[in-house]
Amino acid sequence: SGTTNTVAAYNLTWKSTNFKTILEWEPKPVNQVYTVQISTKSGDWKSKCFYTTDTECDLTDEIVKDVKQTYLARVFSYPAGNVESTGSAGEPLYENSPEFTPYLETNLGQPTIQSFEQVGTKVNVTVEDERTLVRRNNTFLSLRDVFGKDLIYTLYYWKSSSSGKKTAKTNTNEFLIDVDKGENYCFSVQAVIPSRTVNRKSTDSPVECMGQEKGEFRE
């Protein structure tokens, strides 16, 4: 039959950061193509990435409809040039993905320090509120919009002239910290979702130091 050399997809893996979500799998196709389907536990299957020779499929548009739902995907394998052909049981070969709950599992992207402003012995450090692909009322929501108080940021800061670090946490996107007058400080932030058990922390933001462009100083 035409399915003799068709192999099922394997190693189905969700790759998701700030809700941008791609399903990846193996193997690279040889004389076969793939179609992906996705559904919620209680929903209908929706087909995506029809008859593709890629080994990835962007499912962001589907998962952002409700990031708190749990999704399942499956990858169908068809013989190239004969996509109507079915497997021995009368249906195409397919493999299921692990379940994926975006709200609980999407990786937190590397944050960015938007600005810092010194007024006397206080510095206000602001973290950029990154836009996600999650929509509400035709507008894209920010990370803070989606996670609310579930999202905190940890700030690490230190004098440029010394190695001793301090830390602070915020449940907004701003820190107000005390500094020594006349000293330059460096800053790095990390996003955290403390209620999670996996993918809890982002990587650190790039380090920003006073005396560089992002800062502002007022007596």
Partner: antibody, heavy 117, light 107 residues
Framework: QVQLLESGAVLARPGTSVKISCKAS????????MHWVKQRPGQGLEWIGG????????MYDPKFQGRVTITADTSTSTVFMELSSLRSEDTAVYYC??????????WGQGTLVTVSS | DIQMTQSPSSLSASVGDRVTITCKAS??????LSWYQQKPEKAPKSLIY???SLADGVPSRFSGSGSGTDYTLTISSLQPEDFATYYC?????????FGGGTKVEIK
């Protein structure tokens, strides 16, 4: 389940150093922050410092800065605290604790360090 | 550094009593406040996190409230196993600071 297992009791001479350990199981230490807390006999709790094993950032209470070093070995899920220039006031139980971001939610059983000549 | 003032330092109460312990921070700690129970010769145990949330396995007679600089731990009906020392901890910024502790004794 989550466990923090600390090393055994230590007797040390004044002026020397001790290094105590805390082996974590049931979670990945890189996903959390790890801290050390001191409790002298009959006294309250005192934060010494903490570490983010994911990036190596360590923070210390200024009272201990320069005498304490906190490190983490992610390959063995172990956190260490080294305290140098020991004095009698360092006689205490030392606890390691996991910080979720919301609280120190799990604690080790404590390590008694006795400083005596 | 942020100072945590915990009161009272000790109290005597009977089984069934309602007990309230307070912690006042020297500046806004944005709810990064947790409460711990410690019994003699034992490690502290987490009771309340993020000012108001009950830790896993903790009886519902324990509750936390407050925001900004003022926080409260309440035990609605004291049980025999609740006689212990209680500590608050601010972890909004380093150095983290504990309250001085409240010893709850049997009247």
């Amino acid at each position: 389940q989550v466990q923090l297992l600390e090393s055994g009791a230590v007797l040390a001479r004044p002026g020397t150093s001790v290094k105590i350990s805390c082996k974590a199981s049931g979670f990945n230490i890189k996903d959390y922050y790890m801290h050390w807390v001191k409790q002298r006999p009959g006294q309250g709790l005192e934060w010494i410092g903490g570490d983010d094993p994911a990036n190596g950032h360590s923070m210390y209470d200024p009272k201990f800065q320069g005498r304490v070093t906190i490190t983490a070995d992610t390959s063995t899920s172990t956190v260490f605290m080294e305290l140098s220039s020991l004095r009698s006031e360092d006689t205490a139980v030392y606890y390691c604790a996991r910080d979720s971001g919301y609280a120190m939610d799990y604690w080790g059983q404590g390590t008694l360090v006795t400083v005596s000549s | 550094d942020i100072q945590m003032t915990q009161s009272p330092s000790s109290l005597s109460a009977s089984v069934g009593d309602r007990v309230t312990i307070t912690c006042k921070a020297s500046q806004d700690i944005k709810s990064f406040l947790s409460w711990y129970q410690q019994k003699p010769e034992k490690a502290p145990k987490s009771l309340i996190y993020y000012a108001t949330s009950l830790a896993d396995g903790v009886p519902s007679r324990f509750s936390g409230s407050g925001s900004g600089t003022d926080y409260t731990l309440t035990i609605s009906s004291l049980q025999p196993e609740d006689f212990a020392t209680y500590y608050c901890l601010q972890h909004g910024e380093s150095p983290y600071t504990f309250g001085g502790g409240t010893k709850v004794e049997i009247k």
